[in-house]
């Protein structure tokens, strides 16, 4: 996240962090029921584990961190590496998750957003561009809904209705290693940080998320085929 | 280096179990997932299963019930147990490592295990 | 089931002839798709992963591409050391899986 701040401890009790071992994280991912979450097709790999109520990004132990193995992960069929268009995955937990103030699943969105819908985008990515260098702990930013035309304009011909275009001034954006995490919008997931320009924050350049209004009926089926 | 090996019985008896094991040198078991294959005499590659650092496991719908395959991350191997054996299990047997974007990278030399009386 | 058809099953060509193998998913597998050259006496050698990418040290005449149910493995100009078999393999789900591997498709000198 670029020019972000420090999220309130507490707040993102559904934020998840996807990691290689040891412990090095590479997206962030959402919890939306009990045992799944959902994150970028992009960010699939064989072997991660999952992190769950954690506030920084060092291993360090905190209290109220949960600790999960990935058993399924199962990408939209409509995803295309290396594109962008249907860039979502659910993950399905070995185990159900212990619900507390730190762990908690959140509600996909059913509506589609509109332009200047205030949202808010979390993750432990880059908190600078071209240059690397990740956050303490978990960054938030506020952010905000572009038309699809804005959106269609920032990016000729790479957009379409599975994604949405959502920024702020020129210098703040969701970056490397925030991809797959949450854009929660009027306290419902909307989005997942997907793709954009490089380096970012660019002017006119906004990120580009996975519009999850448009897969609330993939989600619910593939979660009650495989639980 | 970054090496398979596998071993075991060249030949089994049929309705016998087949064991095989994989040495792992080079790279550690617990950040790869392995899968082990087979390839009967002439034909194409069959998948049997694989198995996750985690101790996750998935198998071929056909190797269900039939296969076990199991790992000890200390001594760095695979084990891989096919029981009741018919001549139709005789093949060359893979064990492989998966890059973790799901393609088979690193692949042992094979040992053939006939299955004959 | 996620069945994986590939065609030809063999197909004879020359040295530097462009060569195209595909391969087919019963269902959509994204892009979740590997091949592999398998010589006769050794093991399969991973050539592309996720459809397109290529394996560290396969030589750039050989490129994948497709997405969903349909992929192509392209040699673009045939090297004497190409003649051998190739296979593809889905990675989109271990869910009931017969097996992942295609049938193959053997390369031989025209």
């Known amino acids: 996240i670029i020019n972000g701040s420090d999220c309130d401890m507490h707040t993102q009790p559904w934020q998840a962090a996807l990691l290689l071992r040891p412990n090095q994280l590479y997206c962030g991912a959402v919890l939306v029921h009990p045992q799944w979450l959902l994150t970028a097709a992009h960010c699939r790999k064989k072997v991660f584990r999952v992190r769950l109520g954690h506030y920084s990004l060092s291993p360090v132990y905190e209290s109220g961190q949960q600790m999960f193995q990935g058993v399924k992960s199962i990408p939209h069929p409509g995803y295309s590496h290396p594109g962008h268009s249907n860039d979502l995955m659910l993950i399905k937990l070995n185990r159900r998750i212990r619900p507390t103030k730190d762990v908690r699943p959140i509600n996909v969105s059913s509506h589609c957003p509109s332009a200047g819908t205030k949202c808010l985008v979390s993750g432990w990515g880059t908190t600078k561009s071209p240059q690397v260098h990740f956050p303490k702990v978990l960054q938030c930013l506020n952010i905000s809904v572009l038309s699809q035309k804005r959106c269609e304009d920032a990016y000729p011909r790479q957009i379409d209705d599975t994604m949405f275009c959502a920024g702020d001034k020129a210098g703040r954006d969701s970056c490397q290693g925030d991809s797959g995490g949450p854009v929660v919008c009027n306290g419902s997931l909307q989005g997942l940080v997907s793709w954009g320009d490089y380096p970012c924050a660019r002017p006119n350049r906004p990120g580009v998320y996975t519009n999850l209004c448009k897969f609330t009926k993939w989600i619910q089926e593939t979660i009650q085929a495989n639980s | 280096e970054v090496q398979l090996q596998e071993s075991g019985p060249g030949l089994v008896k049929p309705s016998g179990t087949l064991s095989l094991t994989c040495a792992v040198s080079?790279?550690?078991?617990?950040?790869?997932?392995m899968s082990w294959v087979r390839q009967p005499p002439g034909k194409g590659l069959e998948w049997i299963g694989d198995i996750y650092p985690s101790d996750i496991i998935d198998y071929a719908s056909w190797a269900k019930g039939r296969v076990t395959i199991s790992q000890d991350k200390s001594k760095t191997q695979v084990s891989l147990k096919l029981s009741s054996v018919t001549a139709a299990d005789t093949a060359v047997y893979y064990c492989?490592?998966?890059?973790?974007?799901?393609?088979?990278?690193?692949w042992g030399q094979g040992t053939l295990v006939t299955v004959s009386s | 089931a996620y069945d994986m058809t590939q065609s030809p099953s063999s197909l004879s060509a020359s040295v530097g002839d462009r060569v195209t193998i595909t391969c087919q998913a019963s269902q959509s597998i994204s892009s979740w798709l590997a091949w592999y050259q398998q010589k006769p006496g050794k093991a399969p050698k991973l050539l592309i992963y996720l459809a397109s990418t290529l394996a560290s040290g396969v030589p750039s005449r050989f490129s994948g591409s497709g997405s969903g149910t349909d992929f192509t493995l392209t040699i673009s100009s045939l090297q004497p050391e190409d003649f051998a078999t190739y296979y593809c393999q889905q990675g989109y789900t271990n869910s009931n899986i017969i097996n992942t591997f295609g049938g193959g498709t053997k390369v031989e000198i025209k």
């Open positions: 080079g790279f550690p078991l617990s950040n790869y997932a």
């Open positions: 492989a490592r998966d890059n973790n974007d799901y393609g088979l990278d690193i």
